[in-house]
């Protein structure tokens, strides 16, 4: 009897949908695997007789519940199928946005770039998929614990009237208010402000 794949899960970030599993202990030899998806009531092969322990399902439609399954095989024997259901638009992890930061005197000027999507045109981003897409920004004075959060209305934001000659750190994430779903934070970007632009009297 061939044992089934173990720890079967979907690892999906920005609609790059990778079904992953672990090979079970099997004394007779090396196992291969077949992974399938349900399409119009018929299971279709996606990865056949692979020695890998993952299979790319990024070409699935983004909406709808998908049934995926994987089994282990050895010679003419095979395990039972292990099934999972997956809805990309609900289940995919929202990766960190890109961010450009520029210092102008005592202000930080930030521009945000929504994450790109696997198997899409360059300009079709996560912002196009989710109508309610917005950004959360948090910033803090480097070396302090107190963080301030803002929700920009646009793809850019300016933090004004900051302390001169002080290093501030900023990070951004995508947020979907209608789903109350937050994405991953970007890596902090830390920049030092320069002088206060106000002219002395």
């Amino acid at each position: 009897m061939v044992p089934p794949p173990e720890n079967v899960r979907m690892n999906s970030v920005n609609f790059k949908n990778i079904l992953q599993w672990e090979s079970p202990a099997f004394a007779k030899g090396n196992l291969t695997f077949t992974a399938q998806y349900l399409s119009y009531r018929i299971f279709q092969d996606k990865c056949m007789n692979t020695t890998l322990t993952e299979c790319d399902f990024s070409s699935l439609s983004k909406y709808g519940d998908h049934t995926l399954r994987v089994r282990a095989e050895f010679a003419d024997e095979h395990s039972d199928w292990v099934n999972i259901t997956f809805c990309p638009v609900d289940d995919t992890i929202i990766g960190p946005p890109g961010m450009q930061v520029e210092v102008l005197a005592d202000s930080l000027h930030m521009r945000f770039l929504a994450p790109k999507i696997e198997n899409e045109y360059e300009t079709w981003t996560m912002k196009n998929v989710y109508n309610s897409w917005t950004y959360n920004v948090q910033y803090w004075k480097n070396g302090t614990d107190e963080k301030f959060q803002i929700t920009p209305q646009y793809d850019f934001e300016v933090l004004r009237n900051l302390e001169p000659w002080t290093t501030y750190c900023v990070q951004v994430r995508g947020f979907l208010p209608d789903r109350n779903k937050a994405g991953e934070w970007s890596e902090p970007v830390c920049e030092q402000t320069t002088h206060d632009e106000t002219v002395p009297s």
């Epitope: 909406y63 196009n128 109508n131």
Partner: nanobody
Framework: EVQLVESGGGLVQPGGSLRLSCAAS????????IGWFRQAPGKGLEGVSC????????HYADSVKGRFTISRDNSKNTVYLQMNSLRAEDTAVYYC????WGAGCKSEADYDYWGQGTQVTVSS
């Protein structure tokens, strides 16, 4: 059931232009995303362009960027694909597709309704 009807295909010389149209028969083209795809002889389906109803944004495959323009005329319930500087490699059957959800642009899996296609041949 929605029926999409493409028109405007034909034979054109390299460097020439064509304008394809996509209309919904007896229905409004009121879908979040309308896309154009093409299938060259012996090849798979390839995404060409799409237009989003929510913000009017347009998106293109690298192979057609700067040469093709997608647009929509809501008063005529029609989406157009203006194709300029045509090349032999643009020869294909061109399909219009509509998405109910508007989540995707390039992948055929994200579209729900399809037209029958119109042939475009670029040859001298």
């Amino acid at each position: 059931e929605v029926q999409l009807v493409e028109s405007g295909g034909g034979l054109v010389q390299p460097g020439g232009s064509l304008r394809l149209s996509c209309a919904a028969s007896g229905n409004s083209l009121d879908y979040p995303t309308i896309g154009w795809f093409r299938q060259a002889p012996g090849k798979g389906l390839e995404g060409v362009s799409c237009i989003s109803a929510s913000d009017g944004s347009t998106h293109y495959a690298d192979s057609v960027k700067g040469r093709f323009t997608i647009s929509r005329d809501n008063s005529k319930n029609t989406v157009y694909l203006q194709m300029n500087s045509l090349r032999a490699e643009d020869t294909a059957v061109y399909y219009c597709a509509a998405s109910l959800w508007g989540a995707g642009c390039k992948s055929e899996a994200d579209y729900d309704y399809w037209g029958q296609g119109t042939q475009v041949t670029v040859s001298s």
